[in-house]
Structures are given as C-alpha cells and as structure tokens.
C-alpha cells in the first residue's frame, strides 16, 4: 500500500542503492519514488550533521522485506517512496530554497529581477535542470540578481552549500509548465546521432519515449525494433542528449524509431508508467516471486501490488497452468527495464502500474513519527 | 481573497469553480477535487439552488476569463448536503458533489489529500486559502485564481472574536489579528490547505466571516478532519468499494 509517514530523527541502516544531494526530504522522497529500486530513503539536513560531505545527503534504499532497521540520528528524516501512492506521484517540485546554493554545471548566466523569473528561465531552457539566484543583497555586488542555469549528470546537484542571499530551485518542466513545447512525432526508420546517456531494453518506442521523458538528461532517443538486423541490439532504447538540445544529425535506418522527450510539453505529460500488455513477449529479469493467477490482468495487478515488482510475464504454457490459473512471474532489474525481451512465447508481459498517478487515494494521511 | 496574489498554473490543482448557468453564467463558489468523481464544497453554496442541472464545474483552470462556450466542464450527478446542515443554522457547512463523469488526473487537475479523522495533534504552520472571490468587501470576482497565506487561530481565540456565534470544534478559524488577509465573497466552498511534511492537506472549507479581512475577525472554515467518517461513508460506491482508500 501507500505509506506516506515520515520518521523524524531516524535513519534507515543499510540497503543503499544510490545517493545524491537534495535540498530537502521531500525532493529526496520524489527521487526515491522515481528510482526503479528505491523503497525507502533517509535524508540528512544541513543541521543534522557536521560532515560537510554528507550535508543534504539523500540516501535511496531497497529492502527485500520492504523495511530496514531505523537508528536514531538527530535531525535526520526518513520515509517511504510514494510508489503506489496514485495522484501523489509527481516529478513536479515547485519549492524555492532560500540560503542554499545548488551546485552543478553553470551553462548560462543572466540578470533577472526575481527568483521566480530565474525559475521561469530554467523551465524554458531545454537543458536546465536546476538554478541558483543571487539576490539583491548578495555580498558580492557584481553577482547580484545573477540567475545561473545548471545541469548535472544525474539531474541533482553535485553539491549543496549553505550560502546567504542565494535562492535555488528546480526546473518546472515536470510540472508541464515549459513554454518550449514538444515534438510528439515519432520518426519511423530514422536514427538520431549524438551522446548516449543510457541504454535500456523496451518492448516499443512509446515505452522508450516515456523512459526518456523521465530521465534527467534524455532529450531524444532512438529505438531499435525487434527485427533490427543486429540481434544483440534488438529492443534497445538509446537515451540521448546533445549540446544544442536537438539531434545534430539523423540517419535513415530501417527498423529504427526515433523521437523526443516529452518533458517540455505544455499542459500534459505522459504518466510515468506503462500500462500496455504485450502478447507473445517474455520479459527477463531477476525473479521476485511466482504465483498462480487467473488472467494476465490479474498478473499485472499482482505485480502492481507487490511494490518491488517492476514487470511481469504471464505464462500460458500448459506446464505452467493449473485449471484456470497460470504462472505469473514477478520480476525486477537494476534499472527497472527487462534484462532481455524474447518474442514468440506462449504468454504475455507488461509493467507494474505502481507509478501510475490515477489512483484515487485522497485520504493520504501523513503521520510524523518521532523517536 | 483579500490581500492575496496571483496563483500560477498547477499550483492548486484541486481547486474548482462552481458556476451557475441561468440566463448568464457566473462563478458562485469554489470547491476541492478529492477524487476522480468527487468535489467537496460548502453546503450553503446550494441554499436556494439545489437544482443540479444549472451547475457547471470547471476544473484545471487558472483564469476565469479563459472560459468560453467550448471549455469543458463537469456536470453534477448528485449533491449530498450534510444531513445536519440547516439553512436556519450555521453548522455542518459541508457538501459533496458527485460528478456525472470521472475526471482524469493531470498536473493541473488532481485531488487534494484529506486529513486523518479527528486530526487534532498536527500543528499546521503553513496554510493557504485560494479562490476567485472578491479582493475587498466591495469588490468583484477575480479573473485569476488568488492565493493567500493565513495562520490558523485557536477556537478559543476565534470564539472571543465572534461572541454572538458558537464556534464549534467542527470549525477552524484563520486570520491575522490586524486583518488584511482573508477569504471573501465568492471563495465559499473553496479550500483552506496546509502543507505539512511536504504534503498539502485539506484542513478547511471556506464558510463564513464578518466582512472580509477585518481586524480581529478571522475567517471561519468547516473543519474537514471532523467530517472524515461522513466523507468516507458518502463516497463509498454502490458496490461498497471506497472511492478514496486510506493508505496503510
């Protein structure tokens, strides 16, 4: 189920899958929600620790049991991912942090009159992930009203420093507030060039596009279909970026499909989940559980309810069925995508709907537990 | 909203505008989206006009002047006024609207979290009221959704300010001693939301107040936590499955 309580003065021991710097616990929780394996997180505010390297540390954690031992740590905040929390799942983060400088690659500097204007500029710049703004009262006069647009390899700051008269925040592109607009077109038999930021396996170009949309550095993609000439590259989804923000070149290529991230769309973003079921397809991955269920839809529901499950295969092989029920293989991987995709099998595959934000749980009570 | 500022797109995605279409169409009250098919508002919004077919509910909008004859709206399937609300009394000012068709959630149209039943322990320090209501007592409906940050006031303090009224435990008050910031005409039914641990929760429903933003006259809101049993009971679908599940 959806667990929204936060634990103050508590830190989860072990289970680390990733770490990063975030300005507060809520942003850390959001990163946990969108991380394929993260179930729990712990955050160390600046006030909670003297070690400068660990200040603003956000630690993403996984656990086979869904829980980890909590240790007392003054000022620390821990909690759960919001996977399975329906409409509370959003990559949109509007908060502006006063007295905080979020470090990254500064690629654009301009003078603006307010922090809101700086955030707007970041939102309207295709490469900007976060920003810092030096206020009118910043100690160095030449930097006052400077708006620094930034990015980093992981989409989160490379460091966060406490600094007076500086305000920082994130791009509002995930809030569907970009003025850039987006290309909805999918280009058949076309491959984009430029830098690959990640490689995943997907059953089609639409899943590839959604993954690109929610990847911090993906601006466009190329997908190699299941009939691509090189077998080892079939179903490969290449997430790409470039200096300019658009592909520098494209090559006509049979059995490839290319397109753009939809993060810059105005007013509508795709849901961060994939609801389609793929008949005759087997998704390979680490086995989480095998259960007998009646029908592929029930298999998908079972996967969705089991929070660690990322994708599933429902087998229709006679040896995998008992009366009306057949085996439902619940699986996971390091990156949330299948480790292999096989065709021509007797069965169907699909993804967990744990990140779909259509759930109707409005009674989202947050209990804050102190220790 | 008196003393407020313009909201931005998607800032309050649960806010809806309840409008009446007679000869002309006008905004009458606010409301809060709490589920795909449910809006929570004030019972008094329907005083004298309980006919569901004259109402139009606009969600996912920021600027009322953007509404045209082509703007999609929701219609009402059912108005559920609290059984203890009486036009002759000021208590239990709460109503549920069941929409004819469920709404899809987007960044601009999604529900607000409800508090836990009888939530009295949480100390809310970051509360906001939103609406398209008047910006002064002798004002007009605003085009752009307004927002204002207002502190909660204890019921004891509120009762002192309204000695002629009974401020019950099922009400919550908000306002500044010096006035200047408050809800006003046209904001009724809309949300009083508070952010706690990064999550927005619907703490109150805009109900009443003497004048608007007057010194030592806080706004009075229906306390949502006190009506959680009622909300959950009424939003149960006919097959008994809750439309809004309380998470584990």
């Amino acid at each position: 189920g959806c667990l929204t309580q936060l634990y103050e003065n508590a830190f989860f021991r072990g289970g680390d899958v990733a770490s990063m710097y975030t300005p507060n616990a809520q942003y850390c929780q959001m990163r946990c929600t969108f991380h394929p394996r993260c179930l729990l997180f712990s955050f160390l505010p600046a006030s909670s620790i003297n070690d400068m390297e660990k200040r603003f540390g956000c630690f993403l954690k996984d656990s086979v049991t869904g829980t980890l031992p909590k240790v007392h740590r003054t000022g620390a905040v821990s909690g759960h991912s919001l996977k399975q929390c329906g409409h509370q799942i959003s990559a949109c983060h509007r908060d502006i942090y006063k007295g905080v400088d979020m470090r990254g690659v500064n690629f654009n500097v301009s003078k603006v009159s307010s922090v809101e204007e700086c955030q707007k500029r970041c939102t309207s710049n295709i490469r900007c992930q976060f920003f810092s703004y030096a206020t009118q009262t910043f100690h160095k006069a030449e930097y006052r009203n400077n708006c620094l647009l930034k990015y980093s390899p992981g989409g989160t700051p490379t460091a966060i420093k406490v600094l007076s008269n500086v305000e920082s925040g994130f791009s509002l592109k995930p809030c569907a507030l970009s003025e850039i607009g987006c290309h909805m077109n999918i280009f058949q038999h076309l491959a984009f060039s430029d830098v690959d930021v990640a490689r995943v396996l997907t059953p089609d170009a639409f899943v590839c596009r959604t993954i690109c949309t929610y990847h911090p550095n993906c601006l466009f993609f190329t997908f190699y279909t299941n009939v691509w000439k090189i077998e080892s590259q079939r179903n490969v989804c290449l997430l790409k970026t470039s200096e300019s923000g658009t592909p520098s070149s494209s090559t006509p290529q049979e059995n490839t499909i290319s397109g753009y991230s939809l993060l810059t769309c105005k007013r509508t973003l795709p849901e961060p989940c994939h609801s389609k079921i793929y008949p005759g397809v087997d998704f390979g991955g680490e086995e989480l559980n095998v259960t007998f269920v009646k029908g592929v839809n029930v298999c998908q529901e079972t996967c969705t309810k089991m929070i660690r499950c990322q994708f599933f295969t429902y087998s229709l092989l006679p040896e995998d069925c008992k009366e009306e029920k057949c085996k439902c293989f619940l699986r996971l991987s390091m990156d949330g995508s299948p480790t292999r995709i096989a065709y021509g099998t007797q069965g169907s595959s699909g993804y967990s709907l744990r990140l779909c934000n259509t759930g109707d749980n409005s009674v989202c009570t947050t209990k804050t537990s102190t220790r | 909203i008196v003393g407020g500022t313009n909201s931005s797109w998607g800032e309050w995605p649960w806010q809806v505008s309840l409008q009446v279409k007679l000869t002309a169409q006008r905004h009458l009250c606010g409301g809060s989206l709490i589920g795909h098919q449910w809006v929570l508002t004030a019972a008094h919004c329907f005083d004298g006009l309980p006919l569901q077919d004259v109402w139009r509910i606009y969600s996912g909008i920021l600027n009322l002047s953007d509404i045209t004859k082509d703007t999609p709206f929701s219609q009402i399937k059912e108005i559920i006024i609290h059984q203890n609300y009486k036009v002759s009394e000021g208590n239990h000012d709460i109503a549920l609207i069941k929409l004819q068709a469920p709404l899809n959630y987007t960044e601009f149209q999604k529900p607000i979290c409800l508090p836990s039943k009888g939530d009295t322990s949480t100390i809310y320090t970051n509360c906001w009221v939103t609406g398209w209501g008047f910006s002064k007592e002798k004002g007009e409906i605003q085009n752009i959704l307004q927002k204002v940050n207002i502190p909660l006031v204890t019921n004891e303090e509120c009762q002192k300010r309204y000695q002629d009224y009974k401020i019950t435990q099922r009400m919550v008050c908000a306002g500044y001693k010096e006035g200047g910031k408050d809800a006003c005409k046209g904001d009724s039914g809309g949300p009083l939301v508070c952010k706690h641990n990064g999550m927005w929760r619907l703490v109150g429903i805009t109900s009443w107040g003497e004048g608007c933003a007057r010194r030592e006259q806080p706004g009075v809101y229906t306390k949502v936590a006190e009506y959680m049993d009622w909300i959950l009971e009424k939003t149960q679908s006919s097959d008994g499955k809750a439309q809004m599940q309380s998470p584990a």
């Epitope: - | 002309a24 006008r26 905004h27 009458l28 009250c29 004030a42 008094h44 919004c45 005083d47 004298g48 009486k86 036009v87 002759s88 009394e89 000021g90 209501g133 002798k138 007009e140 409906i141 309204y162 000695q163 002629d164 009224y165 809800a183 006003c184 005409k185 046209g186 904001d187 009724s188 039914g189 805009t206 109900s207 009443w208 107040g209 003497e210 004048g211 608007c212 706004g219």
Partner: antibody
Framework: EVQLLESGGGLVQPGGSLRLSCAAS????????MNWVRQAPGKSLEWVSS????????NYADSVKGRFTISRDNSKNTLYLQMNSLRAEDTAVYYC?????????????????WGLGTMVTVSS | DIQMTQSPSSLSASVGDRVTITCRAS??????LNWYQHKPGKAPKLLIY???NLQFGVPSRFSGSGYGTDFTLTISSLQPEDFATYHC????????FGGGTKVEIK
C-alpha cells in the same frame, strides 16, 4: 420557509416613540446583515438603517440619525427598530429586509428577503 | 452620499412590449446595483443583483446591464404580471434607492 414578519407599527403622536420588531425564520439569522427600509405614501423606497450579523456595526440614513436605533437579538432571531422623536415625515410602511450574509458565496448585494411591512403613522 | 436618478418616472406599455428603464449613479458604484419590483400591498422583490445577475426564480425576460454610473433594466417581452413599480438601489456605499419607475398598462 424563509420569512420575515414585522410588527409594532401604529399611530403615534409627533415626538412620540415606537419600537418595531421583525421576526425571522427559515434561515441562519445570525449570519445576515439586516435592514429597515420604508416607503412614505406616494414616495419611493428609502433605506433607513442596517446592522451587521453580530450587531457590532450599525448604519443610519441621515434623516433618522440620532433618533432611531437598530438592534438585534440573535438568540430570538429578531430585529428591532427603536424610533424616538418621531416626526410626521416618518409616516410610512416600514419593511424589514435581509441583506448580504457572513457566508462567503457570491450571492451578495441585494435585499433578497422582505417582510410585508408594518404601517407607522405619525400624526397629532 | 450617492444619489440615484431613475428614468422615466413612469411609462405606459402593452403586453409583449420591450421595456427599458435606466438608472444613473452620482458617482461610480462598480457593479453594486440592484433592481426591485414592487406591487401595492406586497413586499418588494429582488430581480437583479450585481447589475446583471438574475435572482433565482426570476423569469429570464428580465435582464440588467451596466457598470460604473449607468445601468439598465430590460424586460424583453412585457407580461401582464409585470405591471408594477421598479426601483434601482446602490449598495456600494451604504444604500440608496432610485425614485422608482411605474410601468402602467397602455
């Protein structure tokens, strides 16, 4: 049913006093501004006085200021108009009318509920 | 004090006629203008509030318009029950009624 019923009118000599009452039913009396409006024979309507929901704020037309006092008893759902130093020009039908309320919906401004009126005649 | 001037003071019309009554304020009153219908021996009835908003239960042949200082009440097609006196009222600064317009049968 929403209703206002005035009483207390009658014949009074110039310089005399009279107290009008208005009994309200069918609505949250304590949430509404209440008003007295009069109509002298052959004349238009004239607003006389208003009172806020809690009774803390009162207003009067210049023609009655210092002579008339508006008050209310919310526990009895009753509005009053104490009229002293009455003059011949105060002769009129006196109406009690409901004004805008404390509720924050957008149904504002007008006097939407009226009583049938009570006749006050000031004559020697 | 705000003065309200209503015109005409009386008019004669027939059933089915379009009738227009105007009201002018001595200073801007935004949309704070109401229209009432008053019949002898009866309570006045609110028709229009906020210059153009039709009060619930009032027939749609009545409409109001205007902003600031000049306002109009229109009866699109006069019915037998519409013969009465009509009053405008400002509520911007305390309350003032206009002098009334008597609508009589021609």
């Amino acid at each position: 049913e929403v209703q206002l019923l005035e009483s207390g009118g009658g014949l009074v000599q110039p310089g005399g006093s009279l107290r009008l009452s208005c009994a309200a039913s069918g609505f949250t009396f304590s949430f509404y501004n209440m008003n007295w409006v009069r109509q002298a024979p052959g004349k238009s309507l004239e607003w006389v006085s208003s009172i806020s929901p809690s009774g803390g704020e009162t207003n009067y037309a210049d023609s009655v200021k210092g002579r008339f006092t508006i008050s209310r008893d919310n526990s009895k759902n009753t509005l009053y108009l104490q009229m002293n130093s009455l003059r011949a020009e105060d002769t009129a039908v006196y109406y009690c009318a409901r004004g805008g309320g404390a509720y924050r919906n957008n149904w504002w401004g007008g006097f939407d509920i009226w009583g049938l009126g009570t006749m006050v005649t000031v004559s020697s | 004090d705000i003065q309200m001037t209503q015109s005409p003071s009386s008019l004669s019309a027939s059933v089915g006629d379009r009738v227009t009554i105007t009201c002018r304020a001595s200073q801007s009153i935004s949309v704070y203008l109401n229209w009432y219908q008053h019949k002898p021996g009866k309570a006045p009835k609110l028709l229009i509030y906020g210059a153009s908003n039709l009060q619930f239960g009032v027939p749609s042949r009545f409409s109001g318009s205007g902003y600031g200082t000049d306002f109009t009440l229109t009866i699109s097609s006069l019915q037998p029950e519409d013969f009465a006196t009509y009053h405008c009222q400002q509520t911007f600064s305390l309350f003032t009624f206009g002098g009334g317009t008597k609508v009589e049968i021609k």
